[in-house]
Every structure is written in C-alpha cells, then in structure tokens.
C-alpha cells in the first residue's frame, strides 16, 4: 500500500548544459509518466572545494528509493556528482547534503529572485 505519498506534478528545472543539449536553462517542469507510476523531483550538483555547481534539476521517474522523501537530501560521502530526490511539487527547490559519516549538514538555498 502506498499510503499518503505527496503527488508530484511539477518540479524546479535546471540544466547547466542547456546550450549543448538545446534546452531551457531553468524554469519549471511539468512531470509526465505512465499511469500508476509515481513521479519525483531531483537535484544533482558538484561541490568543488566548497563551491556548489548545480548540474541538473527536474522530474525523476518512479524510483523506490525516492518514495516518501519530503526533502531533497543527498547522503553519499564524496561522490563526483551529488544526487537527491523527493516527492511533492517543487520539493527540489532546496537541496541538502547530510553525509552518512556524520559530517556537517549543508543546505543550498536557491538565490532570491531579483525584483522586477
């Protein structure tokens, strides 16, 4: 029984490689999947000496290890690319690294949108 999952319909979208892949650089992505399959949001990034380099954000297909995650939290110690996924609209806006070995928790907030 999949009880009480947050339905994911839209995610924050970002692609650092947007020019090469001929996509938008950022925005919102409406998630589309097969009937009866769950959808998630994800974020991926690199951390070069404390400098965060966002790689991609968007929708993520049904993945059991993403079920019931309300927040986007990466736990791998020191990967080449950090990854997290979550359930709920725009849940990938913020993302966190909380290493399993008990290092410091680091949360990455999106930059505030400039006033128009």
């Amino acid at each position: 029984s999949g009880r009480g999952e947050a339905e994911t319909r839209e995610c924050i979208y970002y692609n650092a490689n947007w020019e090469l892949e001929r996509t938008n650089q950022s925005g919102l992505e409406r998630c589309e999947g097969e009937q009866d399959k769950r959808l998630h949001c994800y974020a991926s990034w690199r951390n070069s000496s404390g400098t965060i380099e966002l790689v991609k954000k968007g929708c993520w297909l049904d993945d059991f290890n993403c079920y019931d995650r309300q927040e986007c939290v990466a736990t791998e110690e020191n990967p080449q690319v950090y990854f997290c996924c979550c359930e709920g609209n725009f849940c990938n806006e913020r993302f966190t690294h909380l290493p399993e070995a008990g290092g410091p928790e680091v949360t990455y907030e999106p930059p505030p949108t400039a006033p128009t």
């Epitope: 999949g2 009880r3 290890n65 990854f83």
Partner: antibody
Framework: EVQLLESGGGLVQPGGSLRLSCAAS????????MSWVRQAPGKGLEWVSG????????FYTDSVKGRFTVSRDNSRNTLYLQMNSLRAEDTAVYYC???????????WGQGTLVTVSS | QTVVTQEPSFSVSPGGTVTLTCGFN?????????PSWYQQTPGQAPRTLIY???TRSSGVPDRFSGSILGNKAALTITGAQADDESDYYC??????????FGGGTKLTVL
Amino acid sequence: EVQLLESGGGLVQPGGSLRLSCAASGFTFRNDAMSWVRQAPGKGLEWVSGISVTGGSTFYTDSVKGRFTVSRDNSRNTLYLQMNSLRAEDTAVYYCAKVYYTSFFDYWGQGTLVTVSS
Amino acid sequence: QTVVTQEPSFSVSPGGTVTLTCGFNSGSVSTSYYPSWYQQTPGQAPRTLIYNTNTRSSGVPDRFSGSILGNKAALTITGAQADDESDYYCVLYMGSGIWVFGGGTKLTVL
C-alpha cells in the same frame, strides 16, 4: 562496511507464523529503502516485499499479500518480515536487501532459511 | 501478470563472449525499468553486477557490461573466465513498488 544480517528462520508447520529480522550496520539505515527477496530450494530469486525509507509505503508480491507484513524500526536499524498463515510453498532462503537509487539491490544479506513442513 | 524471461542456460568457451538477455511479456524493456543484473553461485547470496541498465557495481570487472538490445535488457561478458560460471538474474523495476525477477540463466564455461 555495509552488513545485513538476517535471523528468525527455522522449521514451522503449515498455518504457523514466523518473524524474520534483518539487522543493518555500516550505513545510515533510515536513509535507504529496503526489500525482502526469497529463493526456494533449487529455484530462482523471487521478490517478496519492499518498504520505503519512512515505512510509509509497503508493497508485496501477490502470493504473500494479506499474509506477510514488512516493517522497519529506524531507531534499531532493523527490518522485519512478519509471516503468517505459512504454506509449504513459502519454504525458501529469505534475503534482505538494501535498495538504492534507480531501484536496484546494492547490498544483500547472507539469508535465513524458512522451512514450512508438517 | 508480468513474466520476465531469460535463457535457461548458456555455454561459453573460456575467453569467449556471451550475451544474456532479459525480456518481458508486456512489451519492450527500456531504461525506465532500471534493469539490473545479479550473479549467484550455489550456496551464496547474490552479488550485484550491473544496475540502471549499464552501470557496473563497485568492484565488478569491466568484462561485464549492460545494455538494451532491441526490446530486451542484455548482459554481455567478454573474455569469459572459469569463475564466471554461475547463475545470472535480471530484475526489472515495474514501478509502484514492484520488482520482477527473471527465471535466471545458468552459465557454463567450458
């Protein structure tokens, strides 16, 4: 080092019950989904059940629905499988497995043997 | 009911190449099913070889590779060795918390 250690198997009569446990160490248990997979003697692997990181979502193969219940205690780093109304066809080695992103089983326990026989 | 099919048995000569396949009765296997492959020797727990179609698990030799061939997932072993003689299982994640294992392939190296 990731370790998964199953226990609780044994000989039980048809209609009886058993509770299997899987003690996890070497990783942060609460951060990963878990699953049970079984293997009848001389047969192939069969997925039995899965449970999400919080325990809020549980799933079963059709043949055990209504008889088996999967649960987890994240404070004790332990996964459970409560097996009721056992049948001869449930005789198998039961493995617990850690689930990682892209829904694969990245670590396996050594298994515990459940024998259902009168 | 979904049935995942594998060749029941396969033989390969030492140093040869073999491709095991994994299909199912409800259509084509694609990357969205996150195909994964496991090796098992008698009396042992399964060992993870390939996940997410084509990613080798840590410590797995590069003679093992995964792919999609036509409408099936495939595991290719190049330069087969005697200790590759094992049972090989594919698994498809069907979504909604459900996995289905193939029946397994018994690989003989002779």
